[in-house]
Interface confidence: low
């Protein structure tokens, strides 16, 4: 027989020879990190066919690391479901807890003993320090000094000293999230007031008011013979500017010369801040203009936001 078979878990006792005679026996022992459990044989014999009698290393079992219990408020998950050396133990914390220590431990051989590569980690409760204080505003639970996971605070703005109120810019509610970090940045409180939106050759059809504060929304339509260049709806943004910019009403050109532009609502690069002029007479557009009186909207003389002052 030629050299005897090699195995993952057991090794030949003595040095292998290039050839063995029929009837010659070789013995194996479990490798370092494995231990023998009877009754399976750990030897083989060279038989008449010049082959080795069947033998396997099933009698040699891997050394296993000590049992690790789940950390408090977490789980210890053995990779491949085994504690044998060469494998890993993964640690996860429950929601609202975070891991202190190694996320993965390795079952390693030290001499002939299998031990874990380190100490098991612990799961600590997620706590947040107080959320940011904001200028001109406050948040709920301002007296609480330690917040737990998913605790939420809601911001509100103080009454303003002047005639214009503070507006809350951003999300009003934040919560204590993973990694002891608040879910988002705190909002801010500031006076936001947009200028009166003037559209020449057009008129406002909704959102009437004495002043236009944060998120005030206004709609327009153009006079007969004019089309809207830009959006018919604008909103007062946090920078005290209209978004999109205040639209313009451009004169419809006669069909004989050029086709009127499509209703693209493209934003104009220049702005018009003059008072509206009276509608110029001219040919009607080839497309249907917006209706002039939207049902349900108050007439221009009914200033619906005046009551807010």
């Amino acid at each position: 027989c030629e050299e005897p078979p090699t195995f993952e878990a057991m090794e030949l006792i003595g040095k292998p020879k290039p050839y063995y005679e029929i009837g010659e026996r070789v013995d194996y022992k479990c490798k370092k990190g494995y231990f023998y459990i009877p009754p399976l044989a750990t030897h083989t014999i060279c038989d008449r066919n010049h082959t080795w009698l069947p033998v396997s290393d099933d009698a040699c079992y891997r050394e296993t690391c000590p049992y690790i219990r789940d950390p408090l408020n977490g789980q210890a998950v053995p990779a491949n479901g085994t504690y044998e050396f060469g494998y890993q133990m993964h640690f996860i914390c429950n929601e609202g807890y975070y891991l202190i220590g190694e996320e993965i431990l390795y079952c390693e051989l030290k001499g002939s003993v299998a031990i874990w590569s380190g100490k098991p980690p612990i799961c600590e409760k997620v706590l947040c320090t107080p959320p940011p204080k904001i200028k001109n505003g406050k948040h709920t639970f301002s007296e609480v000094e330690v917040f737990e996971y998913l605790d939420a605070v809601t911001y509100s703005c103080d009454p303003a000293p002047g005639p214009d109120p503070f507006s809350l810019i951003g999300e009003s509610t934040i919560y204590c999230g993973d990694n002891s970090v608040w879910s988002r940045a705190a909002p801010e409180c500031k006076v936001v007031k947009c200028r009166f939106p003037v559209v020449e050759n057009g008129k406002q059809i909704s959102g009437f008011g004495k002043k236009f504060y944060y998120k005030a929304t206004v709609m327009f339509e153009c006079d007969k013979g004019f089309y809207l260049d830009g959006s018919d709806t604008i909103v007062c943004d946090s920078n005290s500017t209209w978004d999109p910019p205040v639209p313009k009403c451009l004169k419809v050109l006669p069909p004989s010369s050029t086709k009127p532009p499509a209703l693209s609502h493209s934003v104009s690069t220049s702005s018009t801040t003059k008072s509206p002029a009276s509608s110029a007479s001219g040919p009607r557009p080839t497309y249907k203009p917006p209706v002039s009186n939207y049902p349900g909207y108050p007439k221009p003389e009914e200033g619906i936001l005046d009551s807010l002052d």
Epitope: T129, P130, K133, E143, V144, E145
Partner: antibody, heavy 118, light 107 residues
Framework: EVQLVESGGGLVQPGGSLRLSCAAS????????ISWIRQSPSRGLEWLGV???????NYNSAFMSRFTISRDDSKNTAYLQMNSLKTEDTAVYYC????????????WGQGTLVTVSS | AIQLTQSPSSLSASVGDRVTITCRAS??????LNWYLQKPGQSPQLLIY???SLHSGVPDRFSGSGSGTDFTLKISRVEAEDVGVYYC?????????FGQGTKVEIK
């Protein structure tokens, strides 16, 4: 590690005023939330107020009208201004660094004694 | 303001005894309670924060427990150096307040 040292205590007549100082060494006073706490045999330990790193303050409402906490970053010092002092304000006054943003007090100084007496 | 009531107001123990001090809050304060020890002639020192967490350098014979309104400080085997006045302190709500103190003496 920042060290806080209180000073400015002494004998004062009822109705009088006194300003206590809390000088920081080894760090900037503006980097920490600073609380004032006092202790007397009759009233025990009492938290008076706090000045936050952003300059904002919170007070114990029982002392809010008479006591003011402030800070001078250029002098690296926090202050407790006490007005309309009463005999029951006699106490040892401590300035305290709030522990890393958490209100537990791990950095007690030696305190300064204020005696209000005629 | 939230009131903290400690009991007993004073106690005398022998070295090696187990000592228990309680602190009761007038309102629910979760676990937002600290314990301090003021040794004779010294400033207070932090022992335990957040009900049961030992401050660095504090011997493990000290332990804290409780939740809500009832809290306990235990010294498993009292030593001569543990004499002084023990205070609890809440910090869930301004103003932060302290208990009236418990004086511990050694027989």
């Amino acid at each position: 590690e920042v060290q806080l040292v209180e000073s400015g205590g002494g004998l004062v007549q009822p109705g009088g005023s006194l300003r206590l100082s809390c000088a920081a060494s080894g760090g900037s006073v503006s980097s920490y939330d600073i609380s004032w706490i006092r202790q007397s045999p009759s009233r025990g330990l009492e938290w008076l107020g706090v000045i936050w790193t952003d300059g904002g303050t919170n007070y114990n409402s029982a002392f809010m009208s008479r006591f003011t906490i402030s800070r001078d970053d250029s002098k690296n010092t926090a202050y407790l201004q006490m007005n309309s002092l009463k005999t029951e304000d006699t106490a040892v006054y401590y300035c305290e660094r709030v522990y890393d943003g958490y209100p537990w007090f791990a950095y007690w100084g030696q305190g300064t004694l204020v005696t209000v007496s005629s | 303001a939230i009131q903290l009531t400690q009991s007993p107001s004073s106690l005398s123990a022998s070295v090696g005894d187990r000592v228990t001090i309680t602190c009761r809050a007038s309102q629910w304060i979760s676990n937002y309670l600290n314990w301090y020890l003021q040794k004779p002639g010294q400033s207070p020192q932090l022992l335990i924060y957040y009900t049961s967490s030992l401050h660095s350098g504090v011997p493990d014979r000290f332990s804290g427990s409780g939740s809500g309104t009832d809290f306990t400080l235990k010294i498993s085997r009292v030593e001569a150096e543990d004499v002084g006045v023990y205070y609890c302190q809440q910090y869930i709500k301004l103003p932060w307040t302290f208990g009236q103190g418990t004086k511990v003496e050694i027989k």
